[in-house]
Every structure is written in C-alpha cells, then in structure tokens.
C-alpha cells in the first residue's frame, strides 16, 4: 500500500472521523432548518461540502473507486454520499436555471446520518428487505383491489351522479336548458336539493331500498360526482381509488353512505366483504410480512 492509502485507511477506521462526520451532518441539518439564513451561512455551506468531499476522498483512497469488490461505489450507502457531493457542486458552480429544484437534493444530506449510525443502518436494511418480501403481498393486494374495483364498476357506475332535482320548473325550462346555464354553487342550490351544511346535492336512487327525494323533487342522473368529482365508480381508476380508500379506511363511512343511498341498502354486503378482506386481512398480512422481515434481519 502507498503511504497515502495507509493514512487514508487509518483516518477511515478512526472513531473520531466518524464522530466528525456525524457532527457535521447534524450541524448541517440544523442550518437547513433556518428560515432566512444570514449571509455568513454560505461560507458554512462551503465548509460542509468540503468536509463531505474530504470524507469521500478518504474513502476512495482507502478502498479504491469502483474496480474492486469492496471499493467506494460498490457500497450503496456511498452512492448517497456521491450524489450529495455531485449536487453540492452542481448547484454552486453550474448555472442550471431552476436551482431551487436542485437545492431540494440538499435534504439528502440528512440521510447520510443513516450510513453513520450503525443501529439505524440495520433498521433501514431491514426495511429494504421487508419491501423486497412485500412484493408478493403487494401483487395480491393490487389483484384483490382490482377485482373489487371491477365489481364496484359494474355495480355502481354512474350511481353517484343521481341527484334530487326540483320538479316545479318554469314553463319554458328543461333539464338540459338548466344544466347549460348553471354556473355558480347558488344556481345549483336553486334546482337541486341540498341538506343543510352539505356541499353536494342530495343523492338518491331508483331502487326501492335506495334514498328517496323529498316532496317536490325527483331523482335524475345529471352533473358531476360528489366531492368535486373525485368520488365515483365511473371508471376503473376511480373505482380502484375508492377501493383503496375502503382498504385504508380513509373516511370510508362517507363513501359507504353515499353509495348505499344511490344504489340501495342491499349493497352493504359488498362493503362488508371489502372491509373484512381488504382492510382487516390484507393490511394485517402486510404488517405480518414487515414483522417477519425485521425478525429475520435481527437474527
């Protein structure tokens, strides 16, 4: 080994070197949180970049760059260090127009903490392993969601567009002429029935067990879907999103009430099956796989 490489190895294995890097990262993180940093922090930034460059140079000189088995670029954690340094110099010396977008990559410096703290490195390693193991469960989840999304599509397509429309129109008004002239929320409230405090027109249905309209209103299928058009089963993608919402139980009871009011109470069976399978079974299966991966990593 050359004297330079010997010195580099000595520095690299020294505990003070690790401490220096860890302190640098933490200090850098503190500086990144500053709202309106003073001018002198620019020099501190250069110092941080210098220390990171020095750390990488030491690692490269000690281990080699990329040819051998244990060289600098063969360790994925060093890719992060490399990217951090490259972006530091890019944002500083190259005029790339939208620099603020590139500055976002400075946040990656905080991730360097993982490679420095051994315990954290193990946990993240376990997390990555669990993601690899999750692939099968994810395929199963997407498959189940897709199947139920297709069922939902067949059962409820267009149902959430059912609204209670005012019957007593002016003599020359028709449904179409009204829909062509409606612009504001107030216009909509004039012709459709709204429950107090509701931002969407009252939903209704055409089956006997679905929601009925109050006197003076009739059920029609017109206009957009509830929640600014985001809640529907009109296409596979919207149905899939609705099913994902059921699986994660994200305000699912509202979707449940809307659909049952528009389609009929019988369809509660669909929601019971989805909640049991998707929300209780699949979510817990995902958690079990993650737990197993952590257990394996610890052993």
């Amino acid at each position: 080994f050359s004297p330079l490489r010997r010195i580099s190895i000595k520095i690299l294995v020294h505990s003070l070197f690790s401490m220096l890097i860890m302190c640098t990262i933490l200090t850098n993180c503190i500086f990144m949180t500053m709202n309106n940093p003073p001018d002198w922090t620019k020099n501190v930034e250069y110092t941080f970049t210098g220390i990171y460059t020095f750390e990488s140079l030491v690692k490269i000189l000690a281990r080699g760059f990329c040819v051998g088995e244990f060289t600098f670029l063969r360790d994925p954690w060093n890719w992060l260090d490399f990217v951090v340094i490259v972006f530091a110099y890019l944002t500083e010396f190259v005029n790339l127009g939208n620099v603020s977008a590139l500055r976002t990559f400075r946040v990656l410096r905080a991730l360097k903490t993982i490679s420095v703290i051994p315990g954290l490195k193990t946990i993240v390693g376990a997390l990555i392993q669990s993601v690899k193991k999750l692939s099968d469960v994810m395929i199963l989840t997407v498959f189940c969601l897709s199947v139920f999304a297709l069922i939902g599509l067949q059962l409820f397509m267009g149902n959430l567009k059912h609204k209670c429309f005012r019957n007593s129109l002016e003599n020359n008004e028709t449904l179409e002429s009204i829909m062509n002239t409606l612009e504001s929320e107030e216009d909509f409230r004039k012709y459709f029935y709204y429950l107090e405090g509701s931002k969407d027109a009252l939903l209704c249905g055409f089956s006997t067990d679905s929601g009925q309209c109050p006197e003076g209103y009739t059920c029609v299928k017109i206009g957009r879907n509830p929640d600014y058009g985001y809640t529907s089963f009109d296409t596979f993608s919207w149905a899939f999103l609705a099913l994902f919402r059921l699986m994660t139980q994200d305000y699912w009871e509202n979707l449940y009430q809307q659909t049952l009011r528009a389609a009929g109470k019988t369809y509660m069976i669909f929601f019971v099956v989805v909640i049991f399978l998707g929300s209780f079974y699949l979510i817990n299966l995902i958690l079990a796989v993650v737990a197993m991966a952590y257990e394996e990593q610890n052993q």
């Epitope: 397509m157 267009g158 149902n159 059912h162 429309f165 019957n167 007593s168 129109l169 028709t174 449904l175 179409e176 055409f206 006197e215 003076g216 009739t218 059920c219 029609v220 299928k221 017109i222």
Partner: nanobody, 124 residues
C-alpha cells in the same frame, strides 16, 4: 330508447270536450314532470299544463278552470282533459317529460323527451 306517444286528438265543436293522453315507453325508471304544450299554426309553442311525480299541477292562465291534467304512475301516462273548448284552442298538442331510463349497455340516463304531437281542431 324512450318514446312519448300522444293520442286523443281530433275535430270537436266549440264548447265540446276531448281527452288527450301521452304514454311513455321504454326502460323507464322514473318520470319527473310531464307537461303539455301547444303550437297553433304560425305561432310560437306555448305551455298548457304540467304535473310532477308527486302530482303537483300547474296551468297556463288561458286554460285554467277548463283543462285538467292527471297522470297514471303505473302506466307512465299523462292525461289532459279539455272541456269548454274554444276555436283558439286549435293547435298541435305536444307532450314533454323528464325521464330517467335505463339505456343501451345498462347505463342510466336522465333527459327531456318530446312526443310527435296530436292535432286538436275546434271548429263549427
């Protein structure tokens, strides 16, 4: 496809009576309102009477007290009973309805549908 068919028109003497009917056919789920309009030769179409699905009625001033609108929910039919007919009632009578129906492919559609019209002639 939804169709509205009017019937009951014909020639009648002033002061006489006629009963027009308008039947809606197709895979109908709900009929909101049903309205009668008329168009005399060389004139614009004018509103005559209306009935909603909860049987609320409304009439044009010119026919109030003489004409009565009614409907048979089960048969998806609306009737216009015309009494004390006058020569100025001579016109082609149209039926219009707000219908929600199941269309091709099983999807639901709401829209305003019109009939072809039935001719009423009041003359001595």
């Amino acid at each position: 496809e939804v169709q509205l068919v009017e019937s009951g028109g014909g020639v009648v003497q002033p002061g006489g009576s006629l009963r027009l009917s308008c039947a809606a056919s197709g895979r109908i789920l709900r009929i909101g309102y049903m309205r009668w309009y008329r168009q005399a030769p060389g004139k614009q179409r004018e509103f005559v009477a209306r009935i909603t699905d909860d049987s609320a009625t409304g009439y044009a001033d010119s026919v109030k007290g003489r004409f009565t609108i009614s409907r048979d929910q089960a048969k998806n039919t609306v009737y216009l009973q015309m009494n004390s007919l006058r020569p100025e009632d001579t016109a082609l009578y149209y039926c219009e309805a707000l219908v929600t129906a199941s269309v091709r492919g099983g999807s639901i559609h709401s829209g305003t549908y019109w009939g072809q019209g039935t001719l009423v002639t009041v003359s001595s």
